[in-house]
Amino acid sequence: SRVDQEERFPQGLWTGVAMRSCPEEQYWDPLLGTCMSCKTICNHQSQRTCAAFCRSLSCRKEQGKFYDHLLRDCISCASICGQHPKQCAYFCENKLRSPVNLPPEL
């Protein structure tokens, strides 16, 4: 809702006329009058609307880790395989299929 957006993101989204809500991975650029990808500003001072996204982007570059939005931190997949979220599926399933666990070839 607009109230929700206003309370959560009081900076950076105000156009002077109305709040503009953007998708999760974008921020409102008042000069351009449009939603912009957070990727473009992750290397600079982060907009508050992009802070979590930029952290998740840098986290995804680390193998075997995922960005947990509930904890707002980078978490190791290795510590939670078995009850892992989908972001860890590739890591955890590969771990299960590692050569140690594979049956000998016929």
Partner: antibody, heavy 123, light 107 residues
Framework: EVQLQQSGPELVKPGASVKISCKTS????????MHWVQQSHGKSLEWIGG????????SYNQKFKGKATLTVDKSSSTAYMELRSLTSEDSAVYYC????????????????WGQGTSVTVSS | SIVMTQTPKFLLVSVGDSITITCKAS??????VVWYQQKPGQSPKLLIY???NRYTGVPDRFTGSGYGTDFTFTITTVQAEDLAVYFC?????????FGGGTKLEIK
């Protein structure tokens, strides 16, 4: 009504371990992360770590890595913190506090806290 | 790690006075600052989130402001029941850090 009910005070010997519980009610346990905060006597608050109840993934303050271990029991909506190799430095009040999803719930920081569990380490 | 420097440590005021507490972050934390009140023998209670938003049920004599590195918390017309320790906390990046606290005492 949201409630976080912590276990009672603990008096433990140096070198021992202690496990504190935080039983929650009045909200959906898996929609909020659970955090633990230390308050040494007459001092400020220090964040120990947090846990995502959905999968048990946890995030720690570097200072408490190896000292604290966070776990949850989803079936009873209870969070636990185990402290090991206790010394007099660990004597403090420990609080659990819930925190909402940054995107899901309207995000309110640590909005509900337990009443605190006093841990005294003494021989 | 971000460090939150809170001043002053103590405040001695009379009922009806106004007080201001400041918190300085060691690097920009956008508006991700939270203020808590801890009354004697109680657990902390959330007062202000996102630097300036009052939490549900918090009287309007409590206000917060700031952005980036400098934040202020004000109580206009202090009441006897405001006797407590007040803490700021940065909620921008882990590890989440608290200020050292300000003990408000009533004359």
């Amino acid at each position: 009504e949201v409630q976080l009910q912590q276990s009672g005070p603990e008096l433990v010997k140096p070198g021992a371990s202690v496990k504190i519980s935080c039983k929650t009610s009045g909200y959906t346990f898996t929609e909020f992360s659970m955090h633990w905060v230390q308050q040494s006597h007459g001092k400020s608050l220090e964040w120990i770590g947090g846990i995502n109840p959905n999968h048990g993934g946890s995030s720690y303050n570097q200072k408490f890595k190896g000292k604290a271990t966070l776990t949850v029991d989803k079936s009873s909506s209870t969070a636990y913190m185990e402290l090991r190799s206790l010394t007099s430095e660990d004597s403090a009040v420990y609080y659990c506090a819930r925190r909402g999803d940054y995107y899901g719930n309207l995000y309110y920081a640590m909005d509900y806290w337990g009443q605190g569990t006093s841990v005294t380490v003494s021989s | 790690s971000i460090v939150m420097t809170q001043t002053p440590k103590f405040l001695l005021v009379s009922v009806g006075d106004s007080i201001t507490i400041t918190c300085k972050a060691s690097q920009s934390v956008s508006n991700d600052v939270v203020w808590y009140q801890q009354k004697p023998g109680q657990s902390p209670k959330l007062l202000i989130y996102y630097a300036s938003n009052r939490y549900t049920g918090v009287p309007d004599r409590f206000t917060g402001s700031g952005y980036g590195t400098d934040f202020t918390f004000t109580i206009t017309t202090v009441q006897a029941e405001d006797l407590a320790v007040y803490f700021c906390q940065q909620d921008y990046s882990s590890p989440w850090a608290f200020g050292g606290g300000t003990k408000l005492e009533i004359k």
